[in-house]
Interface confidence: medium
Amino acid sequence: MMTGTIETTGNISAKKGGSVILQCHLSSTMAQVTQVNWEQHDHSLLAIRNAELGWHIYPAFKDRVAPGPGLGLTLQSLTMNDTGEYFCTYHTYPDGTYRGRIFLEVLESSVAEHSARFQIP
């Protein structure tokens, strides 16, 4: 039975050219996290954090994605094209798969503030 819940940074905004932290947190379960996958809105994989092997950043994003903090992901040198949904997928044993959603809006304005509050989707 899947008892866990994924908390995410929810809807966030950040400045063009800046950076942003995408963060998910799995709680209310004793399941072992074997892997966390980070995907972009078009379903392309940004990065994988495997419990045994550590981080793998996919080549297309190598220059703009930094692993962490923790199981999160830092997107750098943001462009307007980075606006959209991001998904964290937690592969766990024995529960199975948990999925969280974050919506990132990249703003041209210099007054854009990076809001990062945790919320349960």
């Epitope: 045994e52 550590g54 996919y58």
Partner: antibody, heavy 121, light 108 residues
Framework: QVQLVQSGAEVKKPGASVKVSCKAS????????MHWVRQAPGQGLEWMGV????????SYAQKFQGRVTLTRDTSTSTVYMELSSLRSEDTAVYYC??????????????WGQGTMVTVSS | EIVLTQSPGTLSLSPGERATLSCRAS???????LAWYQQKPGQAPRLLIY???SRATGIPDRFSGSGSGTDFTLTISRLEPEDFAVYYC?????????FGGGTKVEIK
Amino acid sequence: QVQLVQSGAEVKKPGASVKVSCKASGYTFTSYYMHWVRQAPGQGLEWMGVIGPSGASTSYAQKFQGRVTLTRDTSTSTVYMELSSLRSEDTAVYYCARDHSDYWSGIMEVWGQGTMVTVSS
Amino acid sequence: EIVLTQSPGTLSLSPGERATLSCRASQSVRSSYLAWYQQKPGQAPRLLIYGASSRATGIPDRFSGSGSGTDFTLTISRLEPEDFAVYYCQQYFSPPWTFGGGTKVEIK
């Protein structure tokens, strides 16, 4: 050019252990992950495990967990695969294969020539 | 783990003909993280295609890969004598990395 040269054929008794070596040349040894794959006679390919550039990170297929150990010796640019508690079903050709990427991509780009391990009483 | 099923098991064709090999995944292989390998008798496998459609270094352009999600295809446009071999697909979406059972392309 990139080359992986494996140790020679082995004949072992059931219950024994075998240690196969894979010597790398033609690239920066400490930058790439190394996979091990086996192939029983007339059968398909079976991934066994992978070891990271420093040797600190390893991941094994569940089937081999507890029986296989991957290690690497940076001074000789050699990776080792040790399989214990051998049984007749372990009779196979064992291959080392270098990863395609300096992160672990899972793409096996360059292969050793293979080492035949025969388990027989 | 992701199970890959290849079909047909054996393909009997003549040199010059077109070969179409299929690989089906038990679940979606996101972003086309699928590779194809060629293996000749007594030899180690050789990487042909990665990313479902990108040819590895030195692979002739008669080899092409396509597909996404759960269905992938390797096409050899015109079989050369040296192409008769066993072909394996492999997913590298996430560990444990798995291979299909293989398709043998033999001379008719």
